[in-house]
């Protein structure tokens, strides 16, 4: 939702969390913001303090229950509110009727370790974290490899384009070290948008058998 | 309190249309859903649909998909069920809810009679 | 459509006793599942809420349990006021479905 020079997005995590984000052109300085979360078909609603991320955005996550409790579906409209402090009372500066599921990003995959190594491939295998059953099988991940004297944005993405919680990297070079990412998005959801990327797993290849030719 | 108080009791031909009306009180009635669920006589519980009256969004069963229409007058915070092309099997007990989590709040139930 | 089963469709019971209903859900449901009473007269009422919430009003010897596909109303010490029909509903998805029914009787 877009009030002039207001920007307010939120993703749901599929379970128990909305992550928001607001921004605002020539932000209101000193000022405690909160954003309201109230669903149209559940008992509970929730607040969260807005703080700041940077000189004109806010950000806050949404706690709706246990990390992995299903605390909204596909029916779900959620309210959401941006409520700023002004004297006595709060006013509304943002508002959106939120689809949860219209509006997915998933927490970044877990676990990340190296099921095996060799001198030219690494087999590498990762969960998922908090991500609702619903989905069954309609996930999608990208991964990227790190090699030497390259950075994250030079590393070519590879697309998984089925629920597979693990790839074999290969066309490695021997004894040499890599970092590995992975992220994950629902086929669901017109605003859906990628996880963030795990945490990098660091690896080394094999180095080649002396002799042999590789 | 929440109350939900319905129109009387009906009798209709076949092919006819009929309008039950759910009339709310005790809350903020554009604040929660309102859901139409009926029962046949000695049967179960049968979903219709809902609607929203803060935007009068709404939702139905495919089973009734072209002969329910579900509507509001937020300004007396009514609902009303109107049901189309009426048929014998029709002969049932309307009920209307308020849903927040779970069908909280119910009215006391509309005989609609189907006969020719 | 989700299909919800509930087992027993009747039973009879003595005051006091612990009495337990089950129902099942077609498919994962989460814990989007709720309990009603009905009474003779047809009056309906709410009992439990996303499985296990307790509705304003309800006595607490009623309780509900379970997660997925598997549910439970249980009433810890039955009253005679509590002879109705009882009905299971799940609200993870459109269309809203219900059990069967599970008809409570005293002996």
């Known amino acids: 939702a877009v009030n002039g020079t207001s920007q307010f997005t939120c993703f749901y995590n599929s379970r128990a969390n909305i992550s928001c984000v607001w921004s605002q052109d020539g932000a209101l300085q000193d000022t405690s913001c909160q954003v309201h979360a109230w669903p149209d078909r559940r008992r509970w609603n929730q607040t969260c303090e807005l703080l700041p991320v940077s000189q004109a955005s806010w950000a806050c996550n949404l706690i709706l229950g246990a990390p992995d409790s299903q605390k909204l579906t596909t029916v779900d409209i959620v309210t959401l509110r941006v409520l700023c402090r002004e004297g006595v009372r709060w006013r509304v500066m943002a508002i959106q009727d939120f689809k949860p599921f219209e509006n997915l990003r998933l927490m970044a995959p877990i676990s990340l370790q190296v099921v095996h190594v060799e001198t030219h491939r690494c087999n590498i295998s990762w969960e998922i974290s908090q991500a609702s059953h619903y989905f069954e099988r309609h996930l999608e991940f990208e991964a990227r490899t790190l090699s030497p004297g390259h950075t994250w944005e030079e590393a070519p993405l590879l697309t998984l384009k089925q629920k597979q919680e693990w790839i074999c990297l290969e066309t490695l070079t021997p004894d040499t070290q890599y970092e590995f990412q992975v992220r994950v998005k629902p086929l669901q959801g017109e605003f859906t948008t990628w996880s963030p990327w795990s945490q990098p797993l660091a690896f080394r290849t094999k180095p080649a058998a002396l002799g042999k030719d590789t | 309190q929440v109350q939900l108080v319905q129109s009387g009791a009906e009798v209709k031909k076949p092919g006819a249309s009929v309008k039950v009306s759910c009339k709310a009180s005790?809350?903020?009635?554009?604040?929660?859903?309102i859901t139409w669920v009926r029962q046949a006589p000695g049967q179960g519980l049968e979903w219709m649909g809902d609607?929203?009256?803060?935007?009068?969004?709404?939702n139905y069963n495919e089973k009734f998909q072209g002969r329910v229409t579900l509507t509001v007058d937020t300004s007396i915070s009514t609902a009303y069920m109107e049901l189309s092309r009426l048929r014998s099997d029709d002969t049932v007990v309307y009920y209307c809810?308020?849903?927040?989590?779970?069908?909280?709040?119910w009215g006391q139930g509309t005989l609609v009679t189907v006969s020719s | 459509d989700i299909q919800m089963t509930q087992s027993p469709s009747s039973l009879s019971a003595s005051v006091g006793d612990r009495v337990t209903i089950t129902c099942r859900a077609s498919?994962?449901?989460?814990?989007?599942l709720n309990w009603y009473q009905q009474k003779p007269e047809g009056t309906l009422k709410l009992l439990i809420y996303?499985?296990?919430g307790l509705h304003s009003g309800v006595p607490s010897r009623f309780s509900g349990s379970g997660s997925g596909t598997d549910f439970t109303l249980t009433i810890s010490s039955l009253q005679p006021e509590d002879v109705a029909t009882y009905y299971c509903q799940q609200d993870n998805n459109h269309p809203y479905t219900f059990g069967q029914g599970t008809k409570l009787e005293i002996k």
């Open positions: 498919q994962d449901i989460s814990n989007f």
């Open positions: 996303y499985t296990s």
């Open positions: 809810a308020r849903e927040r989590g779970g069908f909280d709040y």
């Open positions: 609607i929203y009256p803060g935007s009068g969004n709404t």
């Open positions: 005790g809350y903020t009635f554009t604040s929660h859903w």
